[in-house]
């Protein structure tokens, strides 16, 4: 039999951050290889990662075609050294992944504070707009391009001499906050998609940036 001693994959898991999307599964192969197929609910199956001994497959190129679609993947198990033969009619064992909707489920990557500039008692803090592999008209889109106003940033800011964190929010990538003159402040940002109701609605915090370091600029 063409599928003797092959084990079906299990624990199929989507790992996705800022739309970079990898399907992972188990077990580590012993005398077998895998091929992955992906499709939308209404589309045809497309094969990827042919006869791989890996237990992961990068499906980013497929899901970025329409990040609002819902995708399903499946992993086929074949004997090691398997060569596709036209005469084979036996379907190899396979396992389906959970459904995955990138727009709703991709994790938000850790944001970065690009710069901050103080003018008197105002500070303008700018969050770096991350590029994704999502394209429109042959142009790569930023996270802001993809999510639009669905994506907000929360800024935590505090006096270097104090522990209490004030907050500000924006649906752009810029904050303009009031600060006390002569005080140094530290900043950290968090990306949030408030419309999500699941565990992936917030990113991890950006690295903390403080005034008096190279990212900032001060003008009277």
């Amino acid at each position: 039999s063409g599928t003797t001693n092959t084990v079906a994959a299990y624990n199929l898991t989507w790992k996705s951050t800022n739309f970079k999307t990898i399907l992972e599964w188990e077990p580590k192969p012993i005398n077998q290889v895998y091929t992955v197929q992906i499709s939308t609910k209404s589309g045809d199956w497309k094969s990827k990662c042919f006869y791989t001994a890996d237990t992961e497959c990068d499906l980013t190129d497929e899901i970025v075609k329409d990040v609002k679609q819902t995708y399903l993947a499946r992993v086929f198990s074949y004997p090691a050294g398997h060569v596709e033969s036209t005469g084979s009619t036996e379907e190899p064992p396979y396992e389906n992944s959970p459904e995955f909707t990138p727009y709703l489920e991709t994790n938000l990557g850790q944001p970065t504070i690009q710069s901050f500039e103080q003018v008197g008692t105002k500070v303008n803090v700018t969050v770096q707009d991350e590029w994704t592999l999502v394209r429109r008209n042959d142009t790569f889109l930023s996270l802001r391009d993809v999510f639009g106003k669905d994506l907000i940033y929360t800024l935590y800011y505090w006096k270097s001499s104090s522990s209490g964190k004030k907050t500000a929010k924006t649906n752009t990538n810029e904050f303009l906050i009031d600060v006390d003159k002569g005080e140094n402040y530290c900043f950290s940002v968090q990306a949030v998609i408030p419309s999500r109701r699941t565990a992936n609605r917030k990113s991890t915090d950006s690295p903390v940036e403080c005034m008096g370091h190279e990212k900032g600029e001060s003008r009277e």
Epitope: I152, K165, D178, V192, P194, T198
Partner: antibody, heavy 120, light 107 residues
Framework: EVQLVESGGGLVQPGGSLRLSCAAS????????IHWVRQAPGKGLEWVGY????????YYADSVKGRFTISADTSKNTAYLQMNSLRAEDTAVYYC?????????????WGQGTLVTVSS | DIQMTQSPSSLSASVGDRVTITCRAS??????VAWYQQKPGKAPKLLIY???FLYSGVPSRFSGSRSGTDFTLTISSLQPEDFATYYC?????????FGQGTKVEIK
């Protein structure tokens, strides 16, 4: 169903301590901000402080700074308000409320409140 | 801190009346203002967010508006269940602050 349930209120002497709990269900506190708000008898609403359980960040009203501490245990899906050096003016119903951290970010769900009475 | 000055502190009205409550912010808060309704012995309930957006499940007789730093809550036709205390709140900056409250009583 989203629910917040406060507990731990009671009668305490001036200078004493009390710890209030805010148990959340129907959502994970790690993904939201939790605020504490109080209301003295016959008075208006006064914001006490907040915690972002995902990073532990907090901020307090000047009236409680240095005396009150907000914490969270994400494994228990519960936020806490530790109140020390209590004064008569801290007598109030204490509410916890959820902040969805949206741009408009109002407090969309509130607990039923727990009464704290500071009296000798 | 931003002050929210709410007026009137109380008002008497009849069922069917149009009721208007105002809040003035001491500085710009954009549209980051919410309105809450509170009944005796109960927690506040969100009515309006972002100055003018009706929260889900809230009857359409409630509406909110903004003019600069002035914010208004309007009840177009007061119902028996609307007799309560109403609070505005700004959440533009930390700390978030509440108005003093307006008690709507039966005339």
């Amino acid at each position: 169903e989203v629910q917040l349930v406060e507990s731990g209120g009671g009668l305490v002497q001036p200078g004493g301590s009390l710890r209030l709990s805010c148990a959340a269900s129907g959502f994970t506190i790690n993904n939201y901000i939790i605020h504490w708000v109080r209301q003295a008898p016959g008075k208006g609403l006064e914001w006490v402080g907040y915690i972002d359980p995902s990073n532990g960040y907090t901020y307090y009203a000047d009236s409680v700074k240095g005396r009150f501490t907000i914490s969270a245990d994400t494994s228990k899906n519960t936020a806490y308000l530790q109140m020390n050096s209590l004064r008569a003016e801290d007598t109030a119903v204490y509410y916890c409320a959820r902040d969805p951290q949206s741009l408009s970010s109002p407090f969309d769900y509130w607990g039923q409140g727990t009464l704290v009475t500071v009296s000798s | 801190d931003i002050q929210m000055t709410q007026s009137p502190s109380s008002l008497s009205a009849s069922v069917g009346d149009r009721v208007t409550i105002t809040c003035r912010a001491s500085q710009d808060v954009n549209t980051a203002v919410a309105w809450y309704q509170q009944k005796p012995g109960k927690a506040p309930k969100l009515l309006i967010y972002s100055a003018s957006f009706l929260y889900s499940g809230v009857p359409s007789r409630f509406s909110g508006s903004r003019s600069g730093t002035d914010f208004t809550l309007t009840i177009s036709s007061l119902q028996p269940e609307d007799f309560a205390t109403y609070y505005c709140q700004q959440h533009y900056t930390t700390p978030p602050t509440f108005g003093q409250g307006t008690k709507v009583e039966i005339k």
